[in-house]
């Protein structure tokens, strides 16, 4: 037999299919020009010493073969003895290691069998009613196709599906969408209505993320507040990456999960903007304010579940940094200014109340005064910090108040509101004899003592009603008792106590009269 012809003799090997798992498969035959044809196939298994034979049976029942040697592609003309206008059955027999392996048969009319391409170029992926929709442009001059898909997950083998007939310049396919795992899809096409026509090769992989992006499993830590009033937010654990099917490993466009950081500054609610979304590429600096931080995962189908953390406010206080002067017109605060043209946010809330009850005021951008101080004033009528109770005050600063990540904490401290000097007056002053010339004076703690750092000291005043001599005794703010000694028996005294703050002298308590009785010896 001539090599260019189909040989109508018995092939040069025994006719017995070994039934092994390896062997020839995916036989495709089609016309490649007006008078030439091509068949190609895949061979699975070791290729050393393998000889391939393309077998052909005509409708008359006569059969022939082409010897392809080690090649897996073979061309022949319409003069090779194979009927091209009538239906023929073709298959491949591979002779290897003294056994024959056979491919599945294809039955087709060669003249009408056109080589179909898989979807080429960009395959657009979208979600439609809980399913996956793939769309692509039909390859040139190939309108009218049957389309199949196959898909797999990282843990499952290929599953075959049908896209149905296509008859347009664009083709599409509805496929199953997995909720929580990535999938790899491939598509193939063949001529529509041409009985037995060959399938195209499989397309390049289309990698599809799960419908729900994975929930980010990350942990944050926040550093100590620095001298500049800012603290670095750091990511302790990077988000886990999605497990991908085999063909999607490496660069898999389409399956990417994007993680973003949503920052919500809870403190200073009167500022212009409370939230900002950032890329995880760089962790921001935060002020000492309270924040909620969420990591949002999203993929091409949209956002998934997020994970939220609360970062509590830094409560480190600096009792000396804030000067407060109370005048007839109102109250003014002074603190060391940060820089030129700074906006300050002054926030206050009654101690022991829910953080949601904070009130704040935003200053206009201000430069330091000649003493290098920044100020904030309010009138009594405004009602700000007007109640006689302890307030926690925090001052934040920013040169760009609309930028959430550029606020810094200037100071945090406590302040007793309203008429602190009167409200702080100690009550329940009592005097007890201590010895022949001394007494013990006790009093109930001043309301100011509920406000950390506000009460500077108590002062106890003792007045000799005879000589009108007055002595004053400073007492530590943590003490509510003092011993007065060097007193004379039979003399009337009055004692008073007041509570002082760093900026305000307290009001004396009601005078308490006492005397040490003269001891008469028997």
């Amino acid at each position: 037999c001539r090599t260019s012809e189909c040989c109508f003799q018995d092939p040069p090997y025994p006719d017995a299919d070994s039934g092994s798992a390896s062997g020839p498969r995916d036989l495709r035959c089609y016309r490649i020009s007006s008078d030439r044809y091509e068949c190609s196939w895949q061979y699975e298994g070791p290729t050393a010493g393998v000889s391939h034979f393309l077998r052909c049976c005509l409708s008359s029942g006569r059969c022939c073969y082409f010897a392809a040697g080690s090649a897996t592609r073979l061309q022949f003309s319409d003069q090779a003895g194979v009927s091209v206008l009538y239906t023929v059955t073709l298959w491949v027999e591979s002779w290897a290691r003294n056994q024959t392996e056979k491919s599945p048969e294809v039955t087709l009319q060669l003249y009408n069998s056109v080589k179909y391409e898989p979807p080429l170029g960009d395959i657009k992926v979208s979600k439609l009613a809980g399913q996956l929709r793939m769309e692509w442009e039909t390859p040139d001059n190939q309108v009218g196709a049957e389309v199949q898909f196959r898909h797999r997950t990282p843990s499952s083998p290929w599953k075959l599906g049908d896209c149905g007939p296509q008859d347009d310049d664009t083709e599409s396919c509805l496929c199953p969408l997995e909720m929580n795992v990535a999938q790899e899809f491939q598509l193939r096409r063949r001529q529509l209505g041409s009985q037995g026509s060959s399938w195209s090769k499989w397309s390049s992989p289309v990698c599809v993320p799960p419908e729900n992006p994975p929930q980010p499993q990350v942990r944050f830590s926040v550093e100590q507040l620095g001298q500049d009033g800012r603290r670095r937010l750091t990511l302790k654990e990077q988000p886990t990456q999605l497990e991908l099917p085999e063909g999607c490993q490496g660069l898999a466009p389409g399956t990417e999960v994007t993680y973003r950081l949503q920052l919500h500054m809870l403190s200073c609610p009167c500022k212009a903007k409370a939230t900002r979304t950032l890329h995880l590429g760089k962790m921001p600096y935060l002020s000492g304010a309270a924040y909620n931080v969420a990591v949002i995962s999203s993929n091409q189908f949209g956002p998934g579940l997020n994970q939220t953390w609360h970062i509590p406010a830094d409560t480190h206080t600096e009792p000396v940094a804030l000067n407060i002067s109370v005048g007839t017109n109102g109250t003014t605060m002074y603190w060391p200014a940060r820089a030129q043209s700074m906006t300050y946010c002054i926030e206050w809330q009654p101690v022991g109340q829910d953080g949601g009850l904070a009130t704040c005021s935003l200053t206009a951008p201000q430069d330091p005064d000649p003493a290098g101080m920044a100020t904030y004033s309010w009138s009594r009528e405004s009602g700000a910090m007007g109640q006689e109770k302890c307030y926690y005050i925090t001052i934040f600063a920013s040169a760009h108040p609309e930028k959430l990540t550029l606020w810094s904490t200037v100071l945090s401290t406590y302040h007793f509101g309203g008429n602190a000097s009167a409200a702080g007056t100690p009550h329940h002053v009592s005097v007890k004899n201590h010895s022949l010339d001394s007494v013990s004076v006790d009093w109930a703690p001043s309301l100011l003592s509920t406000c950390p750092g506000v009460l500077k000291e108590y002062v106890v005043r003792c007045r000799d009603e005879d000589s009108k001599q007055v002595s004053e005794h400073p007492v530590q703010p943590t003490e509510t008792q003092v011993t007065l000694s060097g007193l004379r028996a039979g003399v009337a005294y009055t004692v008073q106590v007041r509570a002082d703050t760093a900026w305000l002298r307290g009001v004396w308590s009601q005078p308490q009269r006492f005397s040490i009785e003269v001891q008469v010896s028997d």
């Epitope: 800012r230 973003r260 950081l261 920052l263 900002r276 979304t277 950032l278 890329h279 590429g281 760089k282 962790m283 921001p284 600096y285 040169a399 760009h400 930028k403 990540t405 550029l406």
Partner: nanobody, 124 residues
Framework: EVQLVESGGGLVQAGGSLRLSCAAS?????????IGWFRQAPGKEREGVSL????????YYADSVKGRFTITSDNAKNTVYLQMNSLKPEDTAVYYC????????????????WGQGTQVTVSS
Amino acid sequence: EVQLVESGGGLVQAGGSLRLSCAASGITFDDDYAIGWFRQAPGKEREGVSLISSSDGSTYYADSVKGRFTITSDNAKNTVYLQMNSLKPEDTAVYYCAADPTSGLPSDDEYDYWGQGTQVTVSS
């Protein structure tokens, strides 16, 4: 007054390269700024392509340009560059430079300062 001036756009064949520059005046890159490149194709929303932090050089790239585009900054010249390799027709857009005072890399487009934009056209 802050000004951002882009240059380096043009027409290029698919697979080719371009280098965009963004020269900033009125701000100093030694401060905390996010500087980056956004693009807008006809009929599409503006999207962030690549960002860099002026303070520590941290970067962000959109998935569509990873491995092809590289962002760098020269703080001495107050200039940011975007090296674009293996360009594709879908990279065709007006590319804008933007800067924002911030200590992170914001993913929104609420940036304070914007350039006029430079056209990049990739032909197939």
